[in-house]
């Protein structure tokens, strides 16, 4: 099932997505689109990452994250209920079927009073998945030292551990690492 | 330490081609993008491409396409820029320039520059 | 194309003085700008890389901030080794484009 994320009408919500480049100038191509991922690609494209740069991008989507560290966290700018659904992160790692795909659930609730317009981006409180591709190269993974490797099985559990608490964004700020595989 | 070395000035005429020489030193070449930027006199700066050594791959801005090709010779650790269909608003001072991984693909490292200048 | 738009053009400042320059991008660039000083005859010279990252070698007198749409170099006291031109350049999507470039220099 999806981890979800929570804004209200108005603010910016941020879709966490991370991988660790395996060499430095060589960054994996990242894919975000709004719906479930689909078997290839994503479907309904709001941005796309290349080995460089941010090379497609839709009006209100932006990576305000250290993209070419590997942090492709979406931020959705000022809200609508409208932006409500699945959001896919999908890393394309070279070869056949490697890609790391990251369904993520966007739930945008009514704002309680009518906001002054902020770019505090609401996070939910679910643990943001990293994953660090095996690769040759000085790649930078900052890993918190309290925190085992853990696998996907147990990234769920964790995050819905986690939900609704503030760990998960001082985890984050951290530059806590999951690896994957 | 790190050094970018350029080719001298060119002299052309309206509609040939230039085409400028950049050697790395001091670092692993294929390791870094080298960027082409250019400054026509008296004015402010402008992005041609890049290209990555170690791939070749390369992304050029899209005002220039078709009239630049950029390439690299590892065995020389040597860039080159070369730009073709020359026309009098080419005159300027091309740059290459070394995008730096860790300072985020902005450029640590410049040649000196190589002026062109494109006259009939 | 991104474009970055600086402002002043042109500023005078008095030695010792504090120097501010902006920058402002026509779409949000996260934290992907770097700042330049460029003096007459030479290449520029990379200051500020990830918006607020000082390079190596840099004076701590200059810094930068921001974040998504506008940008800020500060130079706290000014001196006279800092009249140049000072460039903003985003690097979040190719065209990388420059600000038109602030001159700098002593009222």
């Known amino acids: 099932s999806e981890v979800e994320y929570r804004a209200e009408v108005g603010q910016n919500a941020y879709l966490p997505c991370f991988y660790t480049p395996a060499a430095p100038g060589n960054l994996v191509p990242v894919c975000w689109g709004k719906g479930a991922c689909p078997v290839f690609e994503c479907g309904n494209v709001v941005l796309r990452t290349d080995e460089r740069d941010v090379n497609y991008w839709t009006s209100r989507y932006w990576l305000n994250g250290d993209f070419r560290k590997g942090d492709v966290s979406l931020t959705i700018e000022n809200v609508t209920l409208a932006d409500s659904g699945i959001y896919c992160c999908r890393i394309q790692i070279p070869g056949i079927m490697n890609d790391e795909k990251f369904n993520l659930k966007l739930v945008i609730k009514p704002a309680k009073v009518t906001p002054a317009p902020t770019r505090q981006r609401d996070f939910t409180a679910a643990f943001p998945r990293m994953l660090t591709t095996r690769g040759h190269g000085p790649a930078e993974t900052q890993t918190l030292g309290s925190l085992p490797d853990i696998n996907l099985t147990q990234i769920s559990t964790l995050a819905n551990e986690l939900r609704d608490s503030r760990l998960a964004n001082d985890l984050r700020d951290s530059g806590a690492t999951i690896r994957i595989g | 330490q790190v050094q970018l070395v350029q080719s001298g000035a060119e002299v052309k005429k309206p509609g040939a081609s230039v085409k400028v020489s950049c050697k790395a030193s001091?670092?692993?070449?294929?390791?870094?993008?080298m960027d082409w930027v250019r400054q026509a006199p008296g004015q402010g700066l402008e992005w041609l491409g890049y290209?990555?050594?170690?791939?070749?791959?390369?992304s050029y801005n899209q005002k220039f396409k078709g009239r630049v090709t950029m390439t690299t010779d590892k065995s020389t650790s040597t860039a080159y820029m070369e730009l073709r269909s020359l026309r009098s608003d080419d005159t300027a001072v091309y740059y290459c320039?070394?995008?730096?991984?860790?300072?985020?693909?902005?450029?640590?490292?410049w040649g000196q520059g190589t002026t062109v200048t494109v006259s009939s | 194309d991104i474009v970055m738009t600086q402002s002043p053009d042109s500023l005078p400042v008095s030695l010792g003085e504090r120097a501010t320059i902006n920058c402002k991008a026509s779409?949000?660039?996260?934290?992907?700008v770097a700042w330049y000083q460029q003096k007459p005859g030479q290449p520029p010279k990379l200051l500020i890389y990830?918006?607020?990252n000082r390079y190596t070698g840099v004076p701590d007198r200059f810094s930068g901030s921001g974040s998504g749409t506008d940008f800020t170099l500060t130079i706290s006291s000014l001196q006279a080794e800092d009249v140049a031109v000072y460039y903003c350049?985003?690097?979040?999507?190719?065209?990388?484009?420059f600000g038109q470039g602030t001159k700098l220099e002593i009222k």
């Open positions: 001091g670092y692993t070449f294929t390791d870094y993008y």
């Open positions: 779409q949000s660039v996260g934290n992907n």
């Open positions: 990830y918006a607020s």
């Open positions: 350049q985003q690097h979040y999507s190719s065209p990388y484009t």
């Open positions: 290209i990555y050594p170690n791939n070749g791959g390369t």
């Open positions: 320039a070394r995008g730096g991984y860790y300072s985020y693909y902005s450029y640590d490292y």
